[in-house]
């Protein structure tokens, strides 16, 4: 069905009109405007940008644009007492100190308020001790150290390379291992692509470049002092000792020049295998401590950052729906950056700005979407998804009743190779159909569809002729909408070739070198990839807001549920004897999935046949589609993670960025062979199978005929 049927307007106001209005040149202009000074959360500069965006969205034609403010816990370095790491000799003299700031990029030497590299929410402290190299500080790395190598990290300062998993998980793992401090560094193996020059001559990380970032383990809580509730004027705040997710040991990030000085002296054990070696000219010995002549030297951290309750500002724009104003399609991305935000977030914010402009242009010509579209410029994403989470907490009752979909809009690019999409299975068909209608921006695919280049470059591992679409994890502002509230969500951006580029993220991520010039010179000079991302994100919002029948296909959920059930069953079957001993059966889950599949199939048949001119029946069918994602929410949440309530998906307990399927069962099975009470452990597996089976069955029943 063409989208313009939603409202009785002239056919020129269809998806094509919206897409044709999007211009690469505008995105470029907006990106430049958003990246000239830092916009750190909680600063005056970011407040001014919020007001600018509010003003411009009003000019673009939105019905209303409001600022929503909250007072949340943020973290900043001490301006007069900088953070650094030293090597000290036996007399306590500092014989080496890490750098206090990144050398500024050309043209930015006189910019003030560049926050030096720091790990947000690190406690203060000056621990000193022997160093242990812990690879990526993943769960499996600590297993290797503790169980295989019998190396004890207790009382040690650990040094871990960035990459593979969210930095907060690294810090949590180090804490659990008994470490008294954590040094994070960027290894060239992960942040320096072969054959590319360092910034400013290329897009690689120079030796003095450092990745900033928060090190929280919030598990979806939002502001650490007001979990579950908005940090408003009358909020009751927890004491800092009861705050959610704060690290308990000092943490600090460094670049690879400084890391070289620490790692080159390492003694103790050799690295266990090649996967522990990076690209520096050092032995990558694990330690503990330094070798030979340096064995009396220690490492000392000097961390003086402070946590402060600070005001943040979201910008919320509304384009009222003509037919179903009480149904919300949300497009949101953050505005706050660590420094200039050339990619993260402003490549995304510039795209949102252009999407708002295009929708506003159509609205000025008399068009309205069928459903209400909300646009959001979130604050304090970098400090733990705080702006989006506080707003969703404040509006949770409206959102759970009215929220149709949430489309995320952080960085538009992390490479320029092909499209990358993570979304709910409900959106698979929407994404497929949309990308078949869009032109590919890729070289060698002139005149071909985006779907074709995407499928060629990033094929689905399961279905030939289809592109890969990944599970939603976290680490971005969709988290509260999807994982807590159960609102169908999706995200899209242009990415690198994961097969040839093994580095983690993009090299200059969260460094001072993430500038406008980085994007304009090296990633997307013509802004054609930005435009394509704008078309995908905007096109998804357009269809979700304007199609008569919601563009969700519940049959795709049935397919993945079977895949996830097979996967978790095969993990459990690695313990056949215990499954027999403790009578562990997956029959209930497979039965529920089978029922879901049958009911989804029948629902889809009814969806083809019902009378779409009957507004009551139309609304009823659409509500069943809208509330399907909601049906996967367990009000009690996952064990020890009350704000992760989706039974089918949650961020991995070992990597916030990654999504895990049937997370309750997965976590119950994880490392089960090491549990001291096997009977209790397998009992929890059985309970989680029960919860999953019940939830799938209950969700299936929401798709049954209502009477």
């Amino acid at each position: 069905k063409s989208s313009n049927e939603a409202t009785n307007i002239t056919p020129k106001h269809n998806m094509k009109a919206f897409l044709d209005e999007l211009k690469a040149e505008n995105i470029k202009k907006f990106l430049y405007n958003f990246t000239q000074i830092p916009h750190l959360a909680g600063t005056e500069q970011n407040f001014q940008l919020a007001k600018q965006i509010q003003s411009q969205w009003k000019e673009f034609g939105l019905d209303s644009v409001e600022l929503a403010h909250y007072d949340v816990l943020l973290s900043y370095p001490n301006k007069t007492h900088p953070n650094y790491i030293s090597i000290i000799n036996e007399d306590g003299n500092e014989i080496f100190n890490t750098s206090l700031f990144e050398p500024p990029p050309p043209g930015y030497e006189n910019v003030s308020d560049i926050v030096p590299p720091f790990s947000a929410f690190s406690p203060q402290g000056m621990p000193e001790g022997d160093l242990v190299y812990v690879n990526y500080a993943r769960t499996e790395d600590f297993f290797k150290l503790e169980r295989d190598m019998k190396i004890n990290c207790s009382g040690k300062i650990v040094i871990a390379r960035y990459g593979k998993v969210f930095r907060g998980n690294k810090v949590k793992n180090a804490q659990l291992a008994g470490a008294k401090g954590v040094i994070l560094y960027s290894d060239p193996a992960d942040y320096f692509a072969p054959g590319v020059k360092s910034y400013p001559d290329g897009w690689n990380l120079p030796g003095g470049g450092v990745q900033r970032g928060n090190i929280l383990n919030l598990n979806g809580a939002g502001d650490p002092l007001t979990p579950g509730y908005p940090a408003n004027e009358y909020a009751y705040r927890r004491g800092i000792a009861e705050a959610v997710g704060l690290p308990s040991i000092p943490v600090h990030p460094i670049g690879y020049y400084d890391a070289q000085k620490l790692l080159e002296k390492m003694g103790g054990s050799a690295p266990p295998d090649s996967s522990w070696r990076g690209s520096l000219k050092v032995p990558y010995n694990v330690g503990p401590g330094f070798t030979g002549n340096f064995s009396t030297q220690k490492v000392k951290m000097h961390i003086h950052s402070t946590n402060e309750v600070t005001r943040i500002y979201n910008v919320i724009g509304t384009l009222r729906g003509a037919v179903e104003p009480d149904r919300y399609v949300i497009l949101g991305g953050h505005r706050d950056s660590w420094v200039f935000g050339g990619i993260d977030p402003q490549s995304g914010a510039a795209v949102v700005h252009e999407i708002v402009r295009s929708f506003g242009t159509l609205k000025k010509e008399g068009w309205r979407p069928r459903r209400t579209i909300l646009f959001a410029s979130w604050d304090a994403e970098e400090f733990g998804l705080l702006g989006s989470t506080e707003w969703a907490e404040e509006n949770s009752r409206l959102l759970q009743e009215r929220g149709v979909a949430y489309i995320n809009a952080d960085s538009s690019i992390e490479g320029n190779y092909t499209l990358r999409v993570d979304c709910t299975p409900l959106m698979y068909s929407l994404v497929h159909n949309l990308t078949k209608e869009l032109k590919s921006p890729d070289e060698g695919f002139e005149g071909k569809s985006l779907y074709e280049s995407w499928t060629k470059k990033s094929p689905s591992p399961e279905f030939s002729g289809m592109p890969r679409i990944s599970k939603l994890g976290s680490g971005n502002d969709f988290e509260v909408f999807f994982q807590r509230l159960g609102i169908a969500s999706g995200r899209a951006r242009y990415t690198k070739n994961w097969e040839t580029n093994k580095f983690s993220g993009y090299p200059l991520y969260h460094s001072v070198y993430e500038t406008y010039e980085l994007v304009e010179k090296f990633y997307d000079p013509m802004f054609k990839y930005h435009l394509t991302v704008a078309q995908v994100r905007g096109g998804m919002v357009f269809e979700l807001a304007n199609s008569i029948v919601l563009p969700f296909d519940c049959r795709d959920y049935a397919v993945v549920l079977r895949k996830y059930a097979d996967k978790i069953y095969s993990i459990s079957m690695k313990h056949p004897q215990e499954m027999k001993t403790y009578s562990v059966s997956f029959d209930s889950l497979f039965s529920a999935v089978k029922n879901f599949t049958e009911i989804a199939s029948k629902f889809s048949e009814r969806l083809q046949d019902f009378d779409k001119s009957n507004p009551i029946v139309l609304r009823m069918m659409n509500d069943q589609l809208m509330f399907l994602e909601r049906a996967f929410i367990d009000p009690l949440g996952l064990p020890d993670r009350p704000f992760y309530r989706h039974v089918i998906y949650a961020p991995s307990s070992h990597n916030k960025y990654a999504g895990e399927s049937f997370p309750g069962i997965y976590d119950a099975l994880f490392d089960i062979e090491s549990k001291v009470d096997p009977s209790k452990a397998w009992g929890e597996v059985k309970r989680q199978i029960y919860v999953a089976a019940f939830t799938v069955q209950a969700a299936a029943e929401t798709l049954s005929e209502v009477a």
Partner: antibody, heavy 115, light 107 residues
Framework: EVQLVQSGAEVKKPGASVKVSCKTS????????IHWVRQAPGQSLEWMGN????????TYNQKFQGRVTITVDKSTSTAYMELSSLRSEDTAVYYC????????WGQGTLVTVSS | DIVMTQSPDSLAVSLGERATLSCRAS??????VDWYQQKPDQSPKLLIY???TRHTGVPDRFTGSGSGTDFTLTISSLQAEDVAVYFC?????????FGAGTKVEIK
């Protein structure tokens, strides 16, 4: 109880290859490094290389100049060591050992290289 | 490569007496040294790891000590079942290397 059971003795001609298997049980296979060590008759021990069964990361003794390949099959908790371009001085007992500190050893596999 | 030099080549000690085995590394290896026992026609067995920690089930008459370049394995009261060849090994740098072994016999 941790057990490492190796494949049986082999007699090979010079220039041939040999592949020795090491089937493990009694522990989580992916958690422990697997090393391969050989011992020529009446001689000391010589480390050949190792593998991390979790991710396949390997390190080899450069003395073997690319002649040795260590692999694992996670589905059967089995490690393999293949030595190519055999010569008479490769005649030895070949051991697998589990654990970074060579905590548990297989019973050994005698490989005889003779024309 | 790091060379591990063991001394003596062989050692004859009376039952119940102390046996002291030495191992010297050609460069500093910290405490990254393990000791193994190999009885005739058997596989080696881990005795001591990280220079001084006894492996599970190893009798407390076996003690490891040392750091840097000089390491010692002491059997405080030799038993008949301790007759074997003892190897030291460094795990500080690749390739991992073993000493030539010390043969312990009953006097």
């Amino acid at each position: 109880e941790v057990q490492l059971v190796q494949s049986g003795a082999e007699v090979k001609k010079p220039g041939a290859s040999v592949k020795v298997s090491c089937k493990t049980s009694g522990y989580t296979f992916t958690e422990y490094t697997i090393h391969w060590v050989r011992q020529a008759p009446g001689q000391s021990l010589e480390w050949m290389g190792n593998i991390n069964p979790n991710n396949g990361g390997t390190t080899y003794n450069q003395k073997f100049q690319g002649r040795v390949t260590i692999t694992v099959d996670k589905s059967t908790s089995t490690a393999y060591m293949e030595l190519s371009s055999l010569r008479s001085e490769d005649t030895a007992v070949y051991y697998c050992a589990a654990g970074w500190n060579f905590d548990y050893w297989g019973q050994g596999t005698l490989v005889t290289v003779s024309s | 490569d790091i060379v591990m030099t063991q001394s003596p080549d062989s050692l004859a000690v009376s039952l119940g007496e102390r046996a002291t085995l030495s191992c010297r590394a050609s460069q500093d290896v910290g405490t990254a040294v393990d000791w193994y026992q190999q009885k005739p026609d058997q596989s080696p067995k881990l005795l001591i790891y990280w220079a001084s920690t006894r492996h599970t089930g190893v009798p407390d008459r076996f003690t490891g000590s040392g750091s840097g370049t000089d390491f010692t394995l002491t059997i405080s009261s030799l038993q008949a079942e301790d007759v074997a060849v003892y190897f030291c090994q460094q795990l500080n740098s690749y390739p991992l290397t073993f000493g030539a072994g010390t043969k312990v016999e009953i006097k």
